[in-house]
């Protein structure tokens, strides 16, 4: 079964090595999740040809997936640590419902999908400890999430494949942007 960073023998600190700092732990955690997304994308891409499609061809969808923008303060230009951290946490909280949707979408990578979901929850906790301005973080309404989940699960097979692909790609991009920003903090 997939393990969280720190649980496998390779990640256990050697007797004389320094324990991971909070930033290093977060960095390692994001890289672990990205590896998981890569594995899930492989299964998705083997099932359909959507991975070859350009972004424009897939842009017309009703999903409101979190996305980094200049105003969020996470880019090199206009970088703002506090604003960016709030965006990362808020975005991850918004992705949670989509990660729940992914849970029944994989056959051979079912455990990997669960590991991505669980380690994202842990990542949110790590980041919340790091954030100063927790009041600015908005948590999605459970009822809104429940109805969105129902709606996504009611789609036809082709749309569900498309949704799966878009969620994985958007989540990957969001995490990569987050990692770049966190490495500047």
């Amino acid at each position: 079964a997939p393990v969280l960073p720190g649980e496998d023998s390779k990640d256990v600190a050697a007797p004389h090595s320094q324990p991971l700092t909070s930033s290093e732990r977060i960095d390692k955690h994001i890289r672990y999740i990205l590896d998981g997304i890569s594995a899930l994308r492989k299964e998705t891409c083997n099932r359909s040809n959507m991975c070859e499609s350009s972004k424009e061809a897939l842009a017309e969808n009703n999903l409101n997936l979190p996305k980094m923008a200049e105003k969020d303060g996470c880019f090199q230009s206009g970088f703002n640590e506090d604003t960016c951290l709030v965006k990362i946490i808020t975005g991850l909280l918004e992705f949670e419902v989509y990660l729940e949707y992914l849970q029944n979408r994989f056959e051979s990578s079912e455990e990997q999908a669960r590991a991505v979901q669980m380690s994202t929850k842990v990542l949110i906790q790590f980041l919340q400890k790091k954030a100063k301005n927790l009041d600015a973080i908005t948590t999605p309404e459970p009822t809104t999430n429940a109805s969105l989940l129902t709606k996504l699960q009611a789609q036809n097979q082709w749309l569900q494949d498309m949704t799966t692909h878009l969620i994985l790609r958007s989540f990957k991009e969001f995490l990569q942007s987050s990692l770049r920003a966190l490495r500047q903090m």
């Epitope: 994001i30 990205l34 890569s38 980094m68 230009s77 990569q176």
Partner: antibody
Framework: EVQLVESGGGLVQPGGSLRLSCAAS????????VTWVRQAPGKGLEWVGI???????AYATSAIGRFTISRDNSKNTLYLQMNSLRAEDTAVYYC??????????????WGQGTLVTVSS | AIQMTQSPSSLSASVGDRVTITCQAS??????LSWYQQKPGKAPKLLIY???TLASGVPSRFSGSGSGTDFTLTISSLQPDDFATYYC????????????FGGGTKVEIK
């Protein structure tokens, strides 16, 4: 065939501007990170800047405020707008693609380069 | 800002020699380092990424090792086609840096 082709290089006066193009064929540019790297005559490689999938950009300190990377997905082309050019910007400019499947930047497909000469 | 220091800047070697080039980062970059080969008048070619993973089509005589701040590119038995300039490149962070590449190592015929 999967390839990148740069164009737009030439002779420009100090203080002038130039726009380089990088045309992609055989793949959709919007799915990848693309970077610009330059090489002054007889010198080593110097990273200039990168554009990520989300149109996020990052630049080397020498390029900040003077150079801008953008793309036109409908033309499958990347651009490097260079302003306030100096003699030390004289170099062969390469565009290169990163497959963006991971978090670290690595460039596995390169164009042939275009020469920019800044001189009066 | 992360800086990459490569050494030596040049070396002379014979066909069949074992060649080692080192690259040092000014701070830890995990294993997020690539190696490139460049021949005169040509674009660079990716040899190794993630410090030790061979890029597609690269001969197995090339190998990479290291993690954190210290990295090595080794050519186990130098071939005529290997005389070129080699560059390391950090892919850890491309923000607020002067250059992502090391200064290069020119491998010449002895």
């Amino acid at each position: 065939e999967v390839q990148l082709v740069e164009s737009g290089g030439g002779l420009v006066q100090p203080g002038g501007s130039l726009r380089l193009s990088c045309a992609a064929s055989g793949f959709s540019l919007s799915n990848y990170y693309v970077t610009w790297v330059r090489q002054a005559p007889g010198k080593g490689l110097e990273w200039v800047g990168i554009i990520y999938g989300s149109d996020e950009t990052a630049y080397a300190t020498s390029a900040i405020g003077r150079f801008t990377i953008s793309r036109d997905n409908s033309k499958n082309t990347l651009y490097l707008q260079m302003n306030s050019l100096r003699a030390e910007d004289t170099a062969v400019y390469y565009c290169a693609r990163d497959d963006s499947s991971d978090w670290d930047a690595k460039f596995n497909l390169w164009g042939q380069g275009t020469l920019v000469t800044v001189s009066s | 800002a992360i800086q990459m220091t490569q050494s030596p800047s040049s070396l002379s070697a014979s066909v069949g020699d074992r060649v080692t080039i080192t690259c040092q980062a000014s701070q830890s970059i995990n294993n997020e380092l690539s190696w490139y080969q460049q021949k005169p008048g040509k674009a660079p070619k990716l040899l190794i990424y993630r410090a030790s993973t061979l890029a597609s089509g690269v001969p197995s005589r090339f190998s990479g090792s290291g993690s954190g701040t210290d990295f090595t590119l080794t050519i186990s038995s130098l071939q005529p086609d290997d005389f070129a300039t080699y560059y390391c490149q950090q892919g850890y962070s491309l923000r607020n840096i002067d250059n992502a590449f090391g200064g290069g190592t020119k491998v010449e015929i002895k």
